[in-house]
Amino acid sequence: ATIKLHDQSIGTQQWEHSPLGELCPPGSHRSERPGACNRCTEGVGYTNASNNLFACLPCTACKSDEEERSPCTTTRNTACQCKPGTFRNDNSAEMCRKCSTGCPRGMVKVKDCTPWSDIECVHKESGNGHNI
């Protein structure tokens, strides 16, 4: 059983975690007191692994061209994606780009635009797809 402590001065929940105070579990960070951990504040900070941090990592705010795919929890950062009608290639740091409105002449659309990729077009007589 964990021993819950309450630090009145800052109003954060603390609990005794390990006798040596080396690591705190995901969703928490080290307190100023060795052996105690402070819970991250939902929507404000997170830690996704056991850690020796003195503060939770700040939640990311989605950019103006993005929307929230999943909110920040105490153990997971905010997940953002491009707004409908726009995309950004996986692992790219660029801004979201407008999806193509249609395929070039002689090509047909085989995949709709997603937040991670533009529409996909193929030649009418071919089965090989490629992005434009």
């Epitope: 800052i10 040596l20 105070g21 100023e32 060795p34 052996g35 941090l53 003195f54 503060a55 700040p58």
Partner: antibody, heavy 118, light 111 residues
Framework: EVQLVQSGAEVKKPGASVKVSCKIS????????IHWLRQAPGEGLEWMGW????????DSPQKFHGRVAMTRDTSISTAYMELTRLASDDTAIYYC???????????WGQGTLVTVSS | QSALTQPASMSGSPGQSITISCTGT?????????VSWYQQHPGKAPKLMIY???NRPSGVSNRFSASKSGNTASLTISGLQAEDEADYYC??????????FGGGTKVTVLG
């Protein structure tokens, strides 16, 4: 009232080592993390690292790695900071401080002047 | 060179107000509400004046107040008094699990 009392001034030659002590009274020695900071003459404050008085583990910025050692003797409620391979730019007042809530330092020791001169 | 940027000196007459700025980055001041301010009189150890951006420890005069906007924190001393003449340092916790300080601001009370 919690008090941090540090050892006296030291004069060292370049290449030597210095060990500064910090005795805590008025509260449990192991209740809070201890930090070491320094201030060169006429300069600002520089954080040197944290020390866990329960486990004896410590961490410091890259610039001090391999040169600073933080230890303790819990029987006399005292923390130590040893700095090796001293150079003239290590001349500074060295402070110990306790970690207060919200990642601040309070209270502080009175400081220990370490002068490195040939 | 200090990680946080403060003006080297500021001055004011008794009764006036002065505001000291402290500029960092999104990895320190802007990323965390863990900005502190310390007062240091000559030959003395630093004294905590403000913690967690805006909070005053008990015993610190309410003439000292602080705030933060983006990557810049500010300390305001209102009704300046002779005993306020000192060096003031800002500090912030950082995303590297370390602490950084400003270079300090020397406050002079005129007259």
């Amino acid at each position: 009232e919690v008090q941090l009392v540090q050892s006296g001034a030291e004069v060292k030659k370049p290449g030597a080592s210095v060990k500064v002590s910090c005795k805590i009274s008025g509260d449990s020695f192991t209740a809070y993390f201890i930090h070491w900071l320094r201030q060169a003459p006429g300069e600002g404050l520089e954080w040197m690292g944290w020390f866990n008085p329960i486990s004896g583990t410590a961490d410091s910025p890259q610039k001090f790695h391999g040169r600073v050692a933080m230890t303790r003797d819990t029987s006399i409620s005292t923390a130590y900071m040893e700095l090796t391979r001293l150079a003239s730019d290590d001349t500074a007042i060295y402070y110990c401080a306790r970690q207060h809530h919200s990642n601040t330092f309070d209270p502080w020791g009175q400081g220990t002047l370490v002068t490195v001169s040939s | 060179q200090s990680a946080l940027t403060q003006p080297a000196s500021m001055s004011g007459s008794p009764g006036q107000s002065i505001t000291i700025s402290c500029t960092g980055t999104s990895s320190d001041v802007g990323g965390y509400n863990y900005v502190s301010w310390y007062q240091q009189h000559p030959g003395k150890a630093p004294k905590l004046m403000i913690y967690a951006v805006t909070n005053r420890p008990s015993g610190v005069s309410n003439r000292f107040s602080a705030s933060k906007s983006g990557n810049t924190a500010s300390l305001t001393i209102s009704g300046l008094q002779a005993e306020d003449e000192a060096d003031y340092y800002c500090s912030s916790y950082t995303s590297s699990n370390t602490w950084v300080f400003g270079g300090g601001t020397k406050v002079t009370v005129l007259g």
